[in-house]
Amino acid sequence: GDVEKGKKIFVQKCAQCHTVEKGGKHKTGPNLHGLFGRKTGQAPGFTYTDANKNKGITWKEETLMEYLENPKKYIPGTKMIFAGIKKKTEREDLIAYLKKATNE
């Protein structure tokens, strides 16, 4: 995936609800720093739905690819109001950006 293209997608579609930087504040959605390798519903200090907490998967490229295509299908009961990204290449770009930005 292309990190720069992914950053644009993040700004357009995700940044209104999420921050990515270390120590970034929770908004409508949780801060995403340290996302990769973390289980669902475990960002410290954010109140998740039971659906999110109970999903029990680890965030990595494959799980994010599936989730970002259709969040409500992947985690029924999630409070994330986002229809998803149908284009595979766009999801790959967004994931590349998330991988970089959430670990710096």
Epitope: K60, K99, N103
Partner: antibody, heavy 117, light 107 residues
Framework: EVQLQQSGAELVKPGASVKLSCTAS????????MHWVKQRPEKGLEWIGR????????KYDPKFQDKATITADTSSNTAYLQLSSLTSEDTAVYYC??????????WGQGTTLTVSS | DIQMTQSPASLSASVGETVTITCRAS??????LAWYQQKPGKSPQLLVY???TLADGVPSRFSGSGSGTQYSLKINSLQPEDFGSYYC?????????FGGGTKLEIK
């Protein structure tokens, strides 16, 4: 207790193929990546590749692309490494490991493969 | 593909000394770096992940640092049980290559 149990030592002839197994207990392999790592005698670690058992998605180091095939059977919680067209260069200890990006990191005890006529 | 260059290849140090092992990536790996310890005849064990986070049960004399392309593992007050080989591995993009290793011998 989390454990990765690898199959026993193998002695095989040049040109043959072999399939090594790695059975997990104490965790579900669908929850992480399963990797295979090669270590030749007195040498360093070489990453062969990984599988995401939940999706079947595999990634390989290009230098092992034509040599190795990684598969997983989620029903038996087992990962496999098949090595083909064996030569003396394939003589090594092969480790399976379960890890992704975090603190979860478990390794098998290693399987010794000897290729000799 | 990202290549990992680890140095030194070997070193000898006394109990109580501080040693530092470095790993240089051929591209930015954005802190996706782990350090492993391996004793002869044993499987590798995770020491550090995400460049600086200590794995569960790892003594605090071990510490990881770095960013971008340059990373290091520091062992303070070396103990006899710290002998063995140390490897870095990056997790940024596949292949997730290892460094060449550092053999640490206790004087």
């Amino acid at each position: 207790e989390v454990q990765l149990q690898q199959s026993g030592a193998e002695l095989v002839k040049p040109g043959a193929s072999v399939k090594l197994s790695c059975t997990a207990s104490g965790f579900n392999i669908k929850d992480t990546y399963m990797h295979w790592v090669k270590q030749r005698p007195e040498k360093g670690l070489e990453w062969i590749g990984r599988i995401d058992p939940a999706s079947g998605n595999t990634k390989y180091d290009p230098k092992f692309q034509d040599k190795a095939t990684i598969t997983a059977d989620t029903s038996s919680n087992t990962a496999y490494l098949q090595l083909s067209s064996l030569t003396s260069e394939d003589t090594a200890v092969y480790y399976c490991a379960g890890y992704d990006y975090g603190n979860f990191d478990y390794w098998g005890q290693g399987t010794t493969l000897t290729v000799s006529s | 593909d990202i290549q990992m260059t680890q140095s030194p290849a070997s070193l000898s140090a006394s109990v109580g000394e501080t040693v530092t092992i470095t790993c240089r990536a051929s591209g930015n790996i954005h802190n996706y770096l782990a350090w492993y310890q391996q004793k002869p005849g044993k499987s590798p064990q995770l020491l550090v992940y995400n460049a600086k986070t200590l794995a569960d049960g790892v003594p605090s004399r071990f510490s990881g640092s770095g960013s971008g392309t340059q990373y290091s593992l520091k062992i303070n007050s070396l103990q006899p049980e710290d002998f063995g080989s140390y490897y870095c591995q990056h997790f940024w993009s596949t292949p997730w290559t290892f460094g060449g290793g550092t053999k640490l011998e206790i004087k």
